[in-house]
Structure formats: structure tokens, C-alpha cells
């Protein structure tokens, strides 16, 4: 199509930029004629460093185009995002970040893991993209439940823990109180609601220490709480139903051999917490001598029959209810138990299939006489709260 404008001059023939093409191609371009530039896949339109989605030039009356020719520049995805607790390797070549370049993310071995294979390609849209089409970099999730502990130990009736036995064990210190918790992610601590209830509005006054065996060790890793989440079904001073809380930490802690989360129970874990199955609980609470333990102590204790436990406490403390949200543990003969100062700590079990330790219970309440015969320790049954835990963690 030719417009015959005698007063106007034709525009110079446009030459397509390298890796680009022009449309429409005409023998002559006169006033108001236009052309567009299209780039090959993997190349983008740039005017200098300004990205353009499209380019159209119009021929003007004076015989010049209204804008200069852009470039078709190879897509550059830029340096990939850093991976906390991991690293990135350039597969195509050192620092090559252009179209079809390949990078490989990997996590620090032993203590972190990623769900994908970590391979990303620089795609035509300018984003590093995984084989599943994900544009965000992978996440190095902390490994959970690895321990050097083996069952067979005898808190009350307990014995001292060794380094790496309970790397999830957390010491919670108030001005005048002490309790425990269990690390369940690199920035979340699981504990008992009653242990942190008074601190719920003043979370920052709670001093959190981890990576220690000795209660008074100066070589601890300090963590500070950002927020405390008490289960909405917990009523302070009116029994211990829903005695569970989460503490969000201000910063993620670095996972290593002495600081590691405990796993949460899988759906199948209920079968590992039946009557007479053995769990392990650790703490710095009162020992047989009635003093707070200096060293982290642990005890292996069997799960007690729920009906027996309910009956014992109905007799012992009428009005105190052992609910379906609780599990009991201890020996009928007594001698092994958790005690004051252990509250909030984890009762853990070994998952034979994964060979990882998971938290089955949270030290909650029991008889005033820790370790007394026929008087079991009562623990919050964590498996009942997995949806609650997951909901809090995903929303906050």
C-alpha cells in the first residue's frame, strides 16, 4: 500500500537489527507508514537499557522515522538469587546468565535439604525457571530429627544427655521462671501454652537459648521471640486441655549438629505411640534430688494406657480431666518422669521408617510427686494439632 503524499519524503529503508526482523517489509515507506520490530525467541527489545514489549516506528513528514531502531539483545536473567544455607553453581559457564544458561542450586549438606532437583534454566521471559516451571529459587529447608541418641537410657530417673542427643532442646528463661521447648523449624519453637502464657503479651522478655547441654553454659545460641501463639482452646488456670503454643523467632537460627529441629509426626506416626511404645523426654527440670538439673537429662519412658491414666487422675485430682488431646507416659512402678522445669519440652519417638525423631508429646502436667508409682506424666498429644501448627506457620 502506498500513500502518495507529494509534500513528504520517503523514509530510509529500515534494516532489521541482528536477531530481529521487520514487518511489514515494503519497497518504500512514506508518511504515516509504519514498521514493527520482532526479536527471535531468547532475545528482547531494548532501547539502550530500557525494555520494550513492542516497537513500532512511524514515518514522518520530513522523511525520518519517529524513533531510532532498537536492539534485539539476548535475554539476560541476571545473577541468580542467593540461596540461604546453600549455594549456586554455574553449569553453562562461569557467570553465564543469558538465555538457555543453566545453574544448579544445592543446599549445605547434612543439615539442609531441598524438595526439587535445584536445576534452573534462563528462559525467554527473563526468569530463572525450574523444570517444574517455578520462577522462585528453591528453599533450603532444615533437616529434622537427626540425633546421636539411641534408646536405652534410664530428669527423674534420668541420665545426662550427650552432645547431639537432643539438638532441638530449647531453654526458655523468664525473669524468675524456666521452661523448655522444641525447635520445629529454623524459626519456630513448640512449647506448652502454660509455660509461656504470662509472656504472651511481652514476648521479647523471654530469653531463648539453644545448642547447650549445661543449663548455665555461657556458650549458647541466643534467639529472641517475635511473637507467641497460644492455642485458642487453652484456658489458663482451668485445666491443661490444648496446652500447646508456638513461638516465632525474630531470626532464623543456623542448623548444625547441636541445633536442629525435631520432626513433626507423620499421619502414620500414631501407630508408633501406642501403649507401651517408648518415647524419650529431656529437660533441665527437677531431678530425684529435687534440684534443677545442671546438665540436660533425659529419660526413656513408655506410653501408658489412656484409660488407666484417666482413672488414676480422676481419683487423685477429681475435676482434673485427662482429655483425648493428651497422652500419658511413665511406669506403673514409678521412677521415670518429667518434672517441674521440664514443661514445654518434647516427648520424642523414633520413626523406624525414616530413622528420624519426631515430637509426639509436649511436657504438660502431672502429679505433684514426679515419678511416683501409678502417677503418670501427662503430655499434649501433638498429632492432634498438626493442622493448627501448619496453619500458624504458613500464615505468620
Amino acid at each position: 500500500h502506498h500513500h502518495h503524499h507529494h509534500a513528504s519524503r520517503p523514509c530510509p529503508d529500515p534494516t532489521a537489527p541482528p536477531n530481529g526482523s521487520i514487518s511489514p517489509v515494503q519497497a518504500i515507506y512514506v508518511l504515516k507508514d509504519r514498521f514493527s520490530v520482532f526479536c527471535k525467541t531468547g532475545f528482547e527489545l531494548l532501547q539502550g537499557s530500557v525494555p520494550l514489549k513492542s516497537f513500532t516506528a512511524v514515518c514522518q513528514k520530513d522523511g525520518s522515522w519517529d524513533r531510532p531502531m532498537p536492539e534485539c539483545s539476548i535475554i539476560d536473567c541476571g545473577p541468580p538469587d542467593d540461596l540461604p544455607n546453600g549455594h549456586v553453581d554455574y553449569i553453562t559457564g562461569p557467570e553465564v546468565t543469558t538465555y538457555k544458561a543453566v545453574i544448579q542450586y544445592s543446599c549445605e549438606e547434612t543439615f539442609y535439604t531441598m524438595s526439587s532437583n535445584g536445576k534452573y534454566v534462563c528462559e525467554a521471559d527473563g526468569f530463572w525457571t525450574s523444570s517444574k516451571g517455578e520462577k522462585l529459587p528453591p528453599v533450603c529447608e532444615p533437616v529434622c530429627g537427626l540425633s546421636t541418641h539411641t534408646i536405652g537410657g534410664r530428669i527423674v530417673g534420668g541420665q545426662p544427655a550427650k552432645p547431639g542427643d537432643f539438638p532441638w532442646q530449647v531453654l526458655l528463661l523468664g525473669q524468675t521462671t524456666a521452661a523448655a521447648g522444641a525447635l520445629i523449624h529454623d524459626n519456630w519453637v513448640l512449647t506448652a501454652a502454660h509455660a509461656v502464657y504470662e509472656k504472651r503479651m511481652a514476648a521479647s522478655s523471654l530469653n531463648i537459648r539453644m545448642g547447650i547441654l549445661k543449663r548455665l553454659s555461657p556458650h549458647y545460641t541466643q534467639a529472641w521471640p517475635e511473637e507467641i501463639f497460644i492455642h485458642e482452646g487453652y484456658t489458663h488456670g482451668a485445666g491443661f486441655d490444648n496446652d500447646i503454643a508456638l513461638i516465632k523467632l525474630k531470626n532464623k537460627v543456623t542448623i548444625n549438629g547441636s541445633i536442629m529441629p525435631v520432626c513433626l509426626p507423620r499421619k502414620e506416626a500414631a501407630s508408633l505411640m501406642r501403649t507401651d511404645f517408648t518415647g524419650t523426654v529431656a529437660g533441665w527440670g527437677l531431678t530425684q534430688k529435687g534440684l534443677l538439673a545442671r546438665n540436660l537429662m533425659f529419660v526413656d519412658i513408655p506410653i501408658a494406657d489412656h484409660q488407666k491414666c484417666t482413672a488414676v487422675y480422676e481419683k487423685l485430682y477429681p475435676g482434673v480431666r485427662v482429655s483425648a488431646n493428651m497422652l500419658c507416659a511413665g511406669l506403673e512402678t514409678g521412677g521415670k518422669d518429667s518434672c517441674r522445669g521440664d514443661a514445654g519440652g518434647a516427648l520424642v519417638f523414633l520413626d523406624n521408617e525414616t530413622q528420624r525423631w519426631f515430637v509426639g508429646g509436649i511436657v504438660s502436667w502431672g502429679s505433684i510427686n514426679c515419678g511416683a508409682a501409678d502417677q503418670y506424666g501427662v503430655y499434649t498429644k501433638v498429632i492432634n494439632y498438626i493442622p493448627w501448627i501448619e496453619n500458624i506457620i504458613s500464615n505468620f
Epitope: Q47, G48, S49, V50, P51, L52, K53, S54, F55, R67, P68, D125, G126, F127
Partner: antibody, heavy 118, light 105 residues
Framework: DVQLQESGPGLVKPSQSLSLTCTVT?????????WNWIRQFPGNKLEWMGY???????SYNPSLKSRISITRDTSKNQFFLQLNSVTTEDTATYYC???????????WGQGTSVTVSS | IVMTQSQKFMSTSVGDRVSVTCKAS??????VAWYQQKPGQSPKALIY???YRYSGVPDRFTGSGSGTDFTLTISNVQSEDLAEYFC????????FGSGTKLELK
């Protein structure tokens, strides 16, 4: 007509984060171009901070790269600036602007003054 | 890339012809724009790609140059042209010049 409007707090404390929003009307930020944040210091020196392109890709001034993040919400036709660990040196008038290198007019917001002070 | 506007101020009279210059620290091709800013206002784009005038910009404003040396010329200066002028390179990232203020003699 294309219009850009900045919004956000006028006062930020040192070491905190500065967060600003640019609301665009009259043109979709996914249609084309680069959507920029530019600031002007007392004394009128202009500094380009970074942009988010129509495709969602970002480019940042190398001098700010460790502290800056530009994101967008395409459903609201807004783009955002977050500048971390601010100091008194970050006191300036902050503009959002559509810069196209001559492809379509350049449009600027009216600017929002931000003071960093304790 | 540093864009140097060596003259902070330039004095002129209405009807004069004035040239504002800008020097790039390295080759920026023709990827340069010029902006005008009046007190209390946002910058307004005048020129793109070194020499192309935005629509609506009076033809007394002319841009020229390529590589490292660029000039904005205002022929027949009007009182409304008294403002600060900035150059911008967009060849590699984006950098502004420090500005040149046009004032009456």
C-alpha cells in the same frame, strides 16, 4: 491519560525500612515499558533507583542493590519500593515514573517527600 | 556511567539561544534524554534518543550528539524556559546529570 501517584509514610526512622506505593491509572503496568523509582535529594540531584518492567523483571542501581526491592501487584496496577536500613542520607523526594526511552511519553508522579529522622 | 553537566548555572536573556551540555564518562550511543524541571514540579521529558523531540515540546528545543557529548539547544529562549535541565543516559542502567539551572541575566 496515564497518571502515577506515590503514597507512603513521610517520616521513617533510621535503620528501618522505607516502603512506598505507586498507583498507576490509565495504563496497565503489564502492557509495556519500565516502571521506575527515582529520587531527588535536597539540592536537586536526581538518582535512578531501579525499575520493574512490564514482564515483572527488575533492574536496580548497583549502589542500592543490597537494600532495594521493587515489586508489583498487577491486580491493583500498583508497583512498590522497599528500601531497607535507611539512614538520614535517604531523605529525598521519591518519584515513580514510566520511562520508555522515547517509546510513548514519559510520565512522572508528583513525588512524595520522605524524611529519615529519629 | 557518570553524566557530567559542567555548568551548574547559565545566564540568558529572553530571545537568546543557549546550549546546555552533557558529557558521558563512556560511550552511550544516542541513548540520552533531556528533562526540564521547574520548582515544586516533577521533571518533564523534552528529548529522547539524543535528538528526538517528544510530541507537544516546542520546536525551539533541539537535542544533538552521540557517543559521549550531548547538547540541548534552546533557540529564542522564553521566560517559561527558565528552569533546571537534566540529561539522562539509559544505555547502561540509568544515570542523571547533575543539572544546569537556566536563569535570567
Amino acid at each position: 491519560d496515564v497518571q502515577l501517584q506515590e503514597s507512603g509514610p513521610g517520616l521513617v526512622k533510621p535503620s528501618q525500612s522505607l516502603s512506598l506505593t505507586c498507583t498507576v491509572t490509565g495504563y496497565s503496568i503489564t502492557s509495556d515499558y519500565a516502571w521506575n523509582w527515582i529520587r531527588q535529594f535536597p539540592g536537586n540531584k536526581l538518582e535512578w533507583m531501579g525499575y520493574i518492567s512490564y514482564s515483572g523483571r527488575t533492574s536496580y542501581n548497583p549502589s542500592l542493590k543490597s537494600r532495594i526491592s521493587i515489586t508489583r501487584d498487577t491486580s491493583k496496577n500498583q508497583f512498590f519500593l522497599q528500601l531497607n536500613s535507611v539512614t538520614t542520607e535517604d531523605t529525598a523526594t521519591y518519584y515513580c515514573a514510566k520511562l520508555g526511552g522515547g517509546h510513548g511519553m514519559d510520565y512522572w508522579g508528583q513525588g512524595t517527600s520522605v524524611t529519615v529522622s529519629s | 556511567i557518570v553524566m557530567t553537566q559542567s555548568q551548574k548555572f547559565m545566564s540568558t536573556s529572553v530571545g537568546d539561544r543557549v546550549s546546555v551540555t552533557c558529557k558521558a564518562s563512556q560511550n552511550v550511543d544516542t541513548n540520552v534524554a533531556w528533562y526540564q524541571q521547574k520548582p515544586g514540579q516533577s521533571p518533564k521529558a523534552l528529548i529522547y534518543s539524543a535528538s528526538y523531540r517528544y510530541s507537544g515540546v516546542p520546536d525551539r528545543f533541539t537535542g544533538s550528539g552521540s557517543g559521549t557529548d550531548f547538547t540541548l539547544t534552546i533557540s529564542n529562549v522564553q521566560s517559561e524556559d527558565l528552569a533546571e535541565y537534566f540529561c539522562l543516559q539509559y544505555n547502561s542502567y540509568l544515570t542523571f546529570g547533575s543539572g544546569t539551572k537556566l536563569e535570567l541575566k
